[in-house]
């Protein structure tokens, strides 16, 4: 699966938050990043990502939600030159300072779900999504289609504004 | 479920020390400032003691100001009150309370049950 | 350090009754204001803040309003569990200050 392209076709900021409206949350410790699942207070600062938003070449065969071969996929970068990153090995996601281009665990195929929702497939690792565990982030196989309503993988984005750099 | 436990409360002589603790439990305990607030019997209630999420700073009003220090440790999610050179007009209920996020959102969501602290001879 | 004044100090009141505490504070806050429920045994909870928030779970009968220097808190119809003392609290500036209660008790 190749990026069409080394620039984004759109990037916006937005609050992500998961399918029972706890936020995801971005805290600096020790010069590294911690993500967090938490119960934010409507009067709490909602911490934001930017969504960098590719257009992606892909077999037939592939899952996702594109058209004609094509389908989008995603960076997530709560703070500049830090992105979300599949580790496939640990089963979980890690927040990395990296350098353009960026590597592939990077990057999260897009599904858009029912009800505004939407999950994100890592492009390492086809079948294996972005989703809650215990309070974390965490990489969650996904055995079926039927099961990618699975509330655990599904995510709402709160757009708050169209965005050009950091 | 947030909870806050609050303890450490006991009977002591002017002008001895006491220390108060309170172990927090179901959110990020250091996204979090945290508050001591004291309620005298009978009477209403008084914000003594803030520190900031990392613990970096902390805030105190002039009646416990060099007397009173708060501190925490966030590898045990716990809150503490050293309290030095105690008064009879010390003599309280103690609860600890879960301030703003980071600088944002409105104070003290969530209160420990309180822990009593009586300054006699 | 900024005045909260409480009105009435204590409120008798009957089950089914509408209530309303009010709160004046010495300067404007900007809406940065909460509202604490205190049991007899001491256990306090958040039912309201920015002023007309209410805190999830806590029961539609109670409402916050005002601006400025005025805020209220009402209840729209007591229920028995509703009998305590209320708190204001004003979070606009240091030191951040409570008013002096209002205790609501039974007729």
């Known amino acids: 699966m190749s990026i069409t392209g080394i620039s984004p076709i759109t990037e916006y900021l937005a609050s992500l938050s998961t399918y029972n409206d706890q936020s995801i949350t971005f805290a600096l410790e020790d010069e590294s990043y911690e993500i967090y699942v938490e119960d934010l207070k409507k009067d709490e600062k909602k911490d934001k990502v930017l969504l960098s938003y590719y257009e992606s070449q892909h077999p037939s065969n592939e899952s996702g939600d594109g058209v004609d071969g094509k389908m989008l996929m995603v960076t997530l970068s709560p703070t500049k030159d830090f992105w979300l990153h599949a580790n496939n090995k640990e089963h979980s996601v890690e927040l990395h300072k990296s350098e353009k281009p960026l590597p592939d665990q990077a990057f999260f195929v897009l599904h858009n779900m029912h009800s505004n929702s939407v999950s994100f497939e890592s492009k390492t690792d086809p079948g294996v999504f972005i989703g809650v565990k215990d309070n974390h982030l965490a990489l969650i196989k996904v055995d079926s289609s039927e099961n990618l309503s699975t509330e655990n993988i599904l995510f709402k984005l709160s757009e708050t504004h169209h965005h050009h750099h950091h | 479920e947030v909870q806050l436990v609050d303890s450490g409360g006991d009977q002591v002589q002017p002008g001895r020390s006491l220390k108060l603790s309170c172990v927090a439990s179901?959110?990020?305990?250091?996204?979090?400032?945290m508050t001591w607030i004291r309620q005298v019997p009978g009477k209403g209630l008084e914000w003594i003691a803030s520190?900031?999420?990392?613990?970096?700073?902390?805030y105190y009003p002039d009646s416990v100001k060099g007397r009173f220090t708060i501190s925490r440790d966030n590898a045990k999610d716990t809150l503490y009150l050293q309290m030095n050179s105690l008064r009879s007009e010390d003599t309280a209920t103690y609860y600890c309370?879960?301030?703003?996020?980071?600088?944002?959102?409105?104070?003290?969501?969530?209160w420990g049950q309180g822990t009593l602290v009586t300054v006699s001879s | 350090d900024i005045q909260l004044t409480q009105s009435p100090s204590t409120l008798p009141a009957s089950l089914g009754e509408r209530v309303t505490i009010s709160c004046r504070t010495s300067q404007s806050i900007n809406n940065n204001l909460c509202w604490y429920q205190q049991k007899p045994d001491g256990t306090v909870k958040r039912l309201i803040y920015s002023t007309s928030t209410l805190e999830s779970g806590v029961p539609s009968r109670f409402s916050g309003s005002g601006s400025g220097t005025d805020y209220s808190l009402s209840i729209s119809s007591l229920e028995s569990q509703d009998f305590a003392m209320y708190y204001c609290l004003q979070y606009a500036t240091y030191p951040w200050t409570f008013g002096g209660g209002t205790k609501l008790e039974l007729k």
């Open positions: 309370a879960r301030d703003r996020r980071y600088n944002s959102g409105s104070p003290f969501a969530y």
């Open positions: 179901g959110f990020i305990f250091k996204n979090y400032w």
């Open positions: 520190i900031t999420n990392s613990g970096g700073n902390t």
